[in-house]
Interface confidence: low
């Protein structure tokens, strides 16, 4: 089976605009990838499967997805506990001022998350 | 003072080890990577991957997958690299380097050096 | 792995001149507004030295004759005025994926 969980942090060194609402925007698609390419860094282990349903919100940067991995190979305080000690290397590797983390279980199905 | 202190220089056979140390001083060792750097005869620089000493976290150049070890000693803020199987190819001078942000601006990059470690491969 | 093609391989150029090393890497190096690219100057039997880091900020205590300016995937590595100190070779280093990946080098010399 699968888990998945949701989560949620500020980037506090950037900007919000309209073309974070717009999934066909270069600003939309690098800042997606990147982040992508970060949660791989991050959750190298094999039990991670990838991230979904990234939004961006307002407030400098918030970013929200769905995270999801092998079912028993991870749980929330893992999740939440690993990507907090990442946040140092996230400011040095990808320039990326993090707080207000947060991470929740997500029902099945995941989607009513996004 | 930021400082890397690299081990002396080696001799080896082909087919054996070298195990390189490098000394950190004068920073907080455990947040910054450590990153490897090779200099071989007139084929300029080439990274070997880094490790972050207070995780023991690494990241290897795959060409050398396999074959080079990094590893963190925090209690003497040592960082070693460990290059097995060798060949003439791997004569080379090694460097180890602080990816760190004492770049004005608090940017992060290749900022501090060791002297440089030689290792020659020889039968 | 991104491959820096770095251009010339050696450059001669006369005392007080200015001196232009060129880097293209092949796919884009910068990250959310963010180029990682590193210039390094090393002399022989000496460690590379850094000069300018993400692309165009000089390091702390390299003389401002030295400055570097593109984008995305083409850099420059600028003297503005050689003096006989510069001699060494030059490189630049990506640092937006694994592995990081140098250019071949550029060799300064006096003309």
């Known amino acids: 089976g699968v888990s998945f969980f949701f989560l949620s942090f500020h980037i506090s060194n950037l900007q919000f605009n309209s073309s974070l609402e717009d999934p066909s925007t270069d600003y939309y698609q690098e800042l997606q990838r990147d982040i992508s390419e970060m949660f791989l860094q991050i959750y190298k282990q094999g039990g991670f499967l990838g991230l979904s349903n990234i939004k961006f919100r307002p407030g400098s940067v918030v970013v929200q997805l769905t995270l999801a991995f092998r079912e028993g190979t991870i749980n929330v305080h893992d999740v939440e506990t690993q990507f907090n000690q990442y946040k140092t290397e996230a400011a040095s590797r990808y320039n990326l001022t993090i707080s207000d983390v947060s991470v929740s279980d997500v029902p099945f199905p995941f989607s009513a998350q996004s | 003072e930021v400082q890397l202190v690299q081990s002396g220089a080696e001799v080896k056979k082909p087919g054996a080890s070298v195990k390189v140390s490098c000394k950190a001083s004068g920073y907080r060792f455990i947040p910054y990577w450590i990153e490897w750097v090779r200099e071989r005869p007139g084929h300029g620089l080439e990274w070997m991957g880094e490790?972050?000493?207070?995780?023991?976290?690494?990241n290897y150049n795959e060409k050398f997958k396999g074959r080079v070890t990094f590893t963190a000693d925090t209690s003497t803020n040592t960082v070693y690299m460990e290059l097995s199987s060798l060949t003439s190819e791997d004569t080379a001078v090694y460097y180890c380097?602080?990816?760190?942000?004492?770049?004005?601006?608090?940017?992060?990059?290749?900022?501090?050096w060791g002297q440089g470690t030689t290792v020659t491969v020889s039968s | 792995d991104i491959v820096m093609t770095q251009s010339p391989d050696s450059l001669a150029v006369s005392l007080g001149e200015r001196a232009t090393i060129n880097c293209r890497a092949s796919?884009?190096?910068?990250?959310?507004?963010?180029?990682?690219i590193h210039w390094y100057q090393q002399k022989p039997g000496q460690p590379p030295k850094l000069l300018i880091y993400h692309a165009s900020n000089l390091e702390t205590g390299v003389p401002d004759r030295f400055s570097g300016s593109g984008s995305r995937t083409d850099f420059t590595l600028t003297i503005s005025s050689l003096q006989a100190e510069d001699v060494a070779v030059y490189y630049c280093l990506q640092s937006r994926k694994i592995p990081w990946t140098f250019g071949g080098g550029t060799k300064v010399e006096i003309k």
């Open positions: 490790i972050l000493p207070g995780t023991g976290r690494t």
């Open positions: 380097a602080r990816y760190g942000d004492d770049t004005s601006g608090g940017y992060y990059a290749v900022d501090y």
């Open positions: 796919e884009s190096v910068n990250i959310l507004g963010t180029n990682l």
